[in-house]
Amino acid sequence: CEAPPTFEAMELIGKPKPYYRVGERVDYKCKKGYFYIPPLATHTICDRNHTWLPVSDEGCYREMCPHIRDPLNGEAILANGSYEFGAELHFICNEGYYLIGKDILYCELKDTVAIWSGKPPLCEKILCTPPPKIKNGKHTFSEVEVFEYLDAVTYSCDPAPGPDPFSLIGESMIYCGNNSTWSHAAPECKVVKCRFPVVENGKQISGFGKKFYYKATVMFECDKGYYLNGSDKIVCESNSTWDPPVPKCLKVSTSPTTKSPTSSASGPRPTYKPPVSNYPGYPKPDEGILNNLDD
């Protein structure tokens, strides 16, 4: 017979020879990292028809790492379903807990023994330190020193000393989230008041108010014969300015160079867009580009 068969899990005892006589026996043993469980034979004989009698390595089993229990408030998941060496054990924590240690352990061979690559991790409760205090405002549960996962606080602004109230800029409610950090930055309490939006040759059509505080929204339309240059809707933003800027109502030109829009409230933009100041003083109609619009 020629050289005996080779296997993944077992190896020949002694040195292989190029040829074997009929009736000659060879013995195998389980390779390093494998162990033998009877009764399957681990030897073979050169048969008279010059082939080896059937033999397999199915009696050799991979060395196994010890079973690891799920961590408290978490779970250990075998990546390939067994504890044999080469296995990966993935650890995850339940919601509201975070992992201390390695999130993957590997089943490795040390000499002839299969052991895990490290200590199993722990799942600790997610805790947050108190959220930031803010100027001109406060948050609920200000007396609490430790917050658990998903515990929420709500911010509110103090009454303002003057005639205009403080506006809360940002998220009013934040919660203790992953990584023991708060879900959002603390908001800000400050007076946000936009100026009265003046539009020459037009007027406000919605969002009327005594004063215009944070997030106040105003809409405009232009007089007949004028069209809107800019947005018809503006919002009072946290820096006390309108965004987009207060629009302008420009005269519809009847000169042949400019096509007149059909609507008084909107229409094509002029080729040159005059700059719109932040608020609300616009160039006089007898200055600059507005000349030819008035012709």
Epitope: K193, C194, R195, E200, N201, K203, Q204, S277, N278, G281
Partner: antibody, heavy 118, light 107 residues
Framework: EVQLVESGGGLVQPGGSLRLSCAAS????????ISWIRQSPSRGLEWLGV???????NYNSAFMSRFTISRDDSKNTAYLQMNSLKTEDTAVYYC????????????WGQGTLVTVSS | AIQLTQSPSSLSASVGDRVTITCRAS??????LNWYLQKPGQSPQLLIY???SLHSGVPDRFSGSGSGTDFTLKISRVEAEDVGVYYC?????????FGQGTKVEIK
Amino acid sequence: EVQLVESGGGLVQPGGSLRLSCAASGGSVSSYDISWIRQSPSRGLEWLGVIWTDGGTNYNSAFMSRFTISRDDSKNTAYLQMNSLKTEDTAVYYCERVYDGYPWFAYWGQGTLVTVSS
Amino acid sequence: AIQLTQSPSSLSASVGDRVTITCRASQGIANYLNWYLQKPGQSPQLLIYYTSSLHSGVPDRFSGSGSGTDFTLKISRVEAEDVGVYYCQQYIKLPWTFGQGTKVEIK
């Protein structure tokens, strides 16, 4: 609290020009939006125009071609330049601080009298 | 321009009377209306802004109401110091305009 004081009024002939001043004390004129308003027995109170903190202006179109509002920050003064004056321009002229960016007038000065007569 | 028409043009009241002045706009002005009082020999002074908000220092016997085109200034119990000319002013649209005034006298 800023105080606004008008000056420059007087007698002027029809067709003449006059520049009224509005001097600010206790604050910067450039920090406030300043309107000019006039009052006469025949025409009552009339708003003439405004100069905003950013230097932009809006006018009452009835006076736009003859009246110009400006400001000199170094002199801390706002101005109303009036040209081609008519007899019906005879009035007391007030400069007014627009209330915190809102068009209501809470800070009236004593005004300055302009008389247009030949 | 938006016209404001005040009525009556003048009235005479006794101290303690309730006085009502109306201001009608030629088109809708939402609540963008102010009231002023010009006492004899003085400059005008702001009484009420945004239809019904009392300016600081103004006695609470003054009140304003209305919306759209029709507005009212009420003095619940008129006093001798309330004499003068009352003006309304709109600011929804340029040019900002004033009413012609209502003269209030004490009998």
